[in-house]
Amino acid sequence: LIIGFGISGRHSITVTTVASAGNIGEDGILSCTFEPDIKLSDIVIQWLKEGVLGLVHEFKEGKDELSEQDEMFRGRTAVFADQVIVGNASLRLKNVQLTDAGTYKCYIITSKGKGNANLEYKTGAFSMPEVNVDYNASSETLRCEAPRWFPQPTVVWASQVDQGANFSEVSNTSFELNSENVTMKVVSVLYNVTINNTYSCMIENDIAKATGDIKVTESEIKRRSHLQLLNSKAS
């Protein structure tokens, strides 16, 4: 969480942003809140990006003002106009690209004063893994698949019964480039699996960590998946 304060002249107002990560090809949110004002026409929101000449987005006098918007953001940004009055300056970003990563500034002017806060935005690809029993294999084998990751993640297997065991010798992980030539499909195979055990396939890069669990017993198979974004901190 980053909390910024305004400077000289008018009073300062508190602006708060949250560092976040965008999944390339999907929509992202750059979060920013501020002390609200009672009049929408008195609120100015400017989003800027370090190293970019034009504005990312501007909202003032109750409407979007995009004549100074940078070319890389054309047609890709929107504020939640109906929520500006309650202090929400968050920005929606369409079709996140790798190049959208960087430091953004949320700059606010209201009748109470000015304020700004920076936001670190990471971009990459992350997806939920699915673990299945590979019935085509000669021995009991598990197959962990996740369709989209970038940068290339690490894959680690773990088991509830053999806690602390190193499965690198009995597993094989491959990365297959997807059609858009950026993200990759992750496939990891674990051999010599025993029943009545819970196995976890953990995929991690510097943006996200995802886990796919599978519990194999003689009577049933139970699965569970979980994905967590790393380094989400507020300013």
Epitope: G25, D64, E65, L66, S67, D70, G75, T77, K94
Partner: antibody
Amino acid sequence: QIQLKESGPGLVQPSQSLSITCTVSGFSLTSYGVHWVRQSPGKGLEWLGVIWSGGYTDYNSAFISRLSISKDNSKSQVFFKMNSLQADDTAIYYCARDITTIVEGFAYWGQGTLVTVSA
Amino acid sequence: IIVMTQSPKSMSMSVGERITLNCKASENVGTYVSWYQQKPEQSPKLLIYGASNRYTGVPDHFTGSGSATDFTLTISSVQAEDLADYHCGQTYSYPFTFGSGTKLEIK
């Protein structure tokens, strides 16, 4: 309220150029992009291009060599020019505006101007 | 170029019937699909945007659903005034593209 209105020549000679003006009201061209879409007789809709608030343009690659879109913010007018027209360019030409600043759907359309390419 | 394939090309329905129009994208377009109704001699009218959001003033018997590559427009109870062509379009990536349309006729 929000309105867009196209004005065009109606008839264009083969190999000649087409100029259409879209005059908008109820919103500012510095807030929203304006798109151009055409519809050939009995056919589907075809997106041709857009001019964004900042003046940047994006064109359908099939038309990039003969299409130009410009605007005058102060007059609330968008100008569409297509060169080297042939018979299969006969269509209704529409200007349209998106529902938000992110293109999610064309909520506002002009009435369209029918352009016939014929000698 | 993302190709939007609409099916069926045309359909004839009785008033009160439920119908589903389909639109398939050749690549993932997220939820950037919109649906339009076009009556004879009129401009297209936006019905659904963002795959499932009903536009202001659109009757609630129109419903959109889907994501990625498969999208549907459902008319829960067809009215005589629903006689029109229906187009889907994607605004996920350039060039934006539309399907070839479905003509809805009333029996």
